[in-house]
């Protein structure tokens, strides 16, 4: 480091150092002045600082602080932003694969049910995607709609393929019968349980990551108070007013000042810790029916089983439905 | 063995795909994220110290600035500074957080509540409210596959996590469902999303 300079009788060095921040020299005294108007860098004797310089220092100090805070949170912010994007995309890919699995199952096992089945499956998985992204959709309704839509097609194409076209307006009756007669057994209930649990967890996981980003963004763009600006100015710049161009703040002093400036921000700490630990707990529980990947990629199989269940009970069901929906059919013939 | 759509195909064509080593799974990615986040658990309480360590402070110098004068770095005066005529540091701390900070704390409290509610106790077995005909779900083995429910044909196992990306060399579009084609489609590049 350079040797300590002799006292400056002309404010020459202060002028040059101030030019690092502010081009031009009109704010810097030619020679030391009493500085009675200073509010932050209170002089013990003549000073080379003016009120205007103090104001510039305070403004710069607060900007410095904002930049320091942003650089401190950069890595954390990037971590959460990147992962939120990756997981959102991953979940979308899982949904797309689950839809394709289900469509492939229909195409290869029940070709007569396509293309209607594709349409219902597509609508179901669109709702799944929307739900994950926070849409106000009821999962039970989504599952019910899928089975309500599928059953009339299964009944008319698989169970009763000889049904005349004129009788095809019994759909409403068939939709009602689907629930009343538990046509698919407990499979819809099973799917509801699994899908709702896995999607709820997925949705809250994404919500939590997005809130994490919001927390960092909020603290990243905090505007520091004037009091804080004064404390920082005194720590970083007031030494210049005394011609001390090379000294650095004491470590303990810096900590005291930063704790004062950060008092509000540090209050987040308790809740931030809890956030990370709660998120960890959630992640630890994301398996089996709490893992949407596991659940959605197995849906085709459960749906396949549910259709087999219907086929197994086809004889009994056809008779019952024949009676139950006879009125609808008769109405069509008139 | 995993129960996959290709097992259901009428022509029973089964796609053979080379085993992909070290494939990244969603589950492992989640755990990795948590581990990284945990290294930031003290982020807010450590901020004042972090900022001091990234701004100029006297380390090797004998003398340092305490806001009023040059002092010996290890003297009592080094941390005690002349703030009394200026503004009270205690008052500054007592002012409480800004409204935006209070709002974000409320949001954190809310999400923490939700996360706690959603967190499931470990090792919980699946709901057994299945079919009247006695369909039941039992526990799966300790292998990496997880069961998602049962059927008359026995336990359905689904390959857990994004292994399906490795084992299916293409997107199962209806137009090129397995059986119709065994070619990889350009959509494969989306798989790389899950790798660092």
């Amino acid at each position: 480091q350079p040797p300590p300079p002799p006292p400056d009788a002309t404010c020459h060095q202060v002028r040059s150092f101030f030019q690092r921040l502010q081009p031009g020299l009109k704010w810097v005294p030619e020679t030391p002045v009493p500085g009675s108007d200073l509010q932050v860098c209170l002089p013990k004797g003549p000073t080379c600082c003016s009120r205007k310089m103090e104001e510039k220092y305070q403004l710069t100090a607060r900007l410095n602080m904002e930049q320091l805070l942003q650089s401190a949170s950069m890595e954390l912010k990037f971590l959460i932003i990147q992962n939120a994007a990756v997981f959102q995309e991953a979940f979308e890919i899982v949904v797309r694969h689950a839809k394709n699995y289900t469509n492939a199952m229909f195409k290869n096992n029940y070709p007569s049910l396509t293309p209607q089945a594709f349409e219902f499956v597509g609508e179901f998985f669109t709702d799944v995607s929307l739900y994950i992204l926070g849409s106000d959709i009821n999962v039970d309704d989504m599952v019910n709609e899928l089975f309500d839509s599928l059953f009339p097609v299964i009944y008319t194409q698989l169970m009763n393929p000889g049904l005349p076209d004129s009788a095809l307006d019994i759909n409403e009756c068939l939709r009602g019968a689907r629930r009343d007669l538990k046509v698919f057994g407990n499979f819809p209930k099973l799917i509801m349980t699994q899908v709702s649990k896995s999607l709820q967890v997925t949705r809250i996981f994404l919500q939590a990551l997005n809130l994490g980003i919001e927390v960092i963004n909020t603290t990243d763009h905090l505007k520091f108070s004037k009091d804080c600006g004064r404390m920082l100015t005194r720590m970083w710049y007031c030494s210049y007013c005394q011609g001390l161009m090379m000294v650095k703040p004491c470590g303990g002093y810096c900590n005291v000042v930063m704790q004062g400036c950060m008092a509000g921000v540090v209050e987040i700490d308790k809740y931030w810790r809890e956030y990370i630990l709660s998120l960890e707990e959630l992640v630890n529980g994301m398996y089996r029916i709490y893992d949407m990947e596991n659940v959605l990629l197995g849906l085709f199989s459960t749906i396949h089983d549910s259709i087999q269940y219907v086929q197994k009970n086809a004889g009994k069901l056809t008779t019952t439905i024949g009676k139950l929906c006879a009125h609808s059919q008769q109405r069509q013939y008139r | 063995s995993a129960y996959y759509p290709e097992d259901l195909f009428i022509d029973k064509k089964v796609l053979k795909v080379a085993h992909v080593e070290h494939e990244e799974t969603l589950s492992s990615r989640r755990r990795e994220l948590i581990q990284k986040l945990k290294s930031f658990i003290s982020f807010y309480s450590a901020l004042p110290g972090y900022i001091c360590s990234h701004s100029p402070v006297a380390e090797n110098d004998t003398l340092c600035w305490n806001g009023q004068e040059l002092v010996e770095r290890y003297s009592q005066k080094a941390a005690r500074n002349g703030m009394k005529n200026q503004f009270n540091l205690h008052e500054l701390k007592m002012k409480g957080p800004e409204p935006v900070v209070s709002q974000i704390i409320d949001k954190l409290k809310h999400i923490n509540q939700l996360l706690r509610t959603m967190s499931m106790p470990k090792g919980r077995v699946l709901d057994k409210n299945l079919d009247e005909e006695g369909f039941e779900s039992g526990d799966c083995g300790d292998d990496e596959d997880e069961c998602i429910g049962g059927s008359g044909d026995g336990m359905i196992k689904v390959k857990n996590q994004l292994r399906f990306l490795a084992e299916l060399a293409y997107d199962l579009d209806v137009d090129d469902a397995p059986g119709n084609s065994q070619q990889a489609t350009p959509k494969d590049n989306e798989i790389s999303t899950f790798h660092n």
């Epitope: 101030f18 921040l21 710069t60 100090a61 900007l63 410095n64 930049q67 000294v247 | 701004s55 100029p56």
Partner: nanobody, 120 residues
Framework: QVQLVESGGGLVQPGGSLRLSCAAS????????MSWVRQAPGKGLEWVSA????????NYVDSVKGRFTVSRDNSKNTLYLQMNRLRAEDTAVYYC?????????????WGQGTLVTVSS
């Protein structure tokens, strides 16, 4: 550990030119703003010039504007000060200094300096 080593100083006649270099190591040079500071014999420190990490932004004290040019080569981790039309009052020890993240605040690190003497 951070090291800044200046070189290129010497005796030069008024009106002459010199190019100072500062070799940096121990930190990410390309992301650090750098400054040149000088100290004339028996005088205080005077800030001379600064340059941003990318080299895209420069700043000079009024007394050297138009005569001195600061530049950097991030691939070589080196800072330069091209001094033209030198005057007797430019005689000083020239230090290169690493700027801290506090703009206009105390420097993080200094070199040991190189002496420039302008005399006929």
């Amino acid at each position: 550990q951070v090291q800044l080593v200046e070189s290129g100083g010497g005796l030069v006649q008024p009106g002459g030119s010199l190019r100072l270099s500062c070799a940096a190591s121990g930190f990410t040079f390309s992301s650090s703003a750098m400054s040149w500071v000088r100290q004339a014999p028996g005088k205080g420190l005077e800030w001379v010039s600064a340059i941003s990490g990318s080299g895209g932004s420069t700043n000079y004290v009024d007394s050297v504007k138009g005569r001195f040019t600061v530049s950097r080569d991030n691939s070589k981790n080196t800072l330069y000060l091209q001094m033209n039309r030198l005057r007797a009052e430019d005689t000083a020890v020239y230090y290169c200094a690493k700027e801290s993240m506090v703009r206009g605040g105390p420097f993080d690190y200094w070199g040991q300096g190189t002496l420039v003497t302008v005399s006929s």
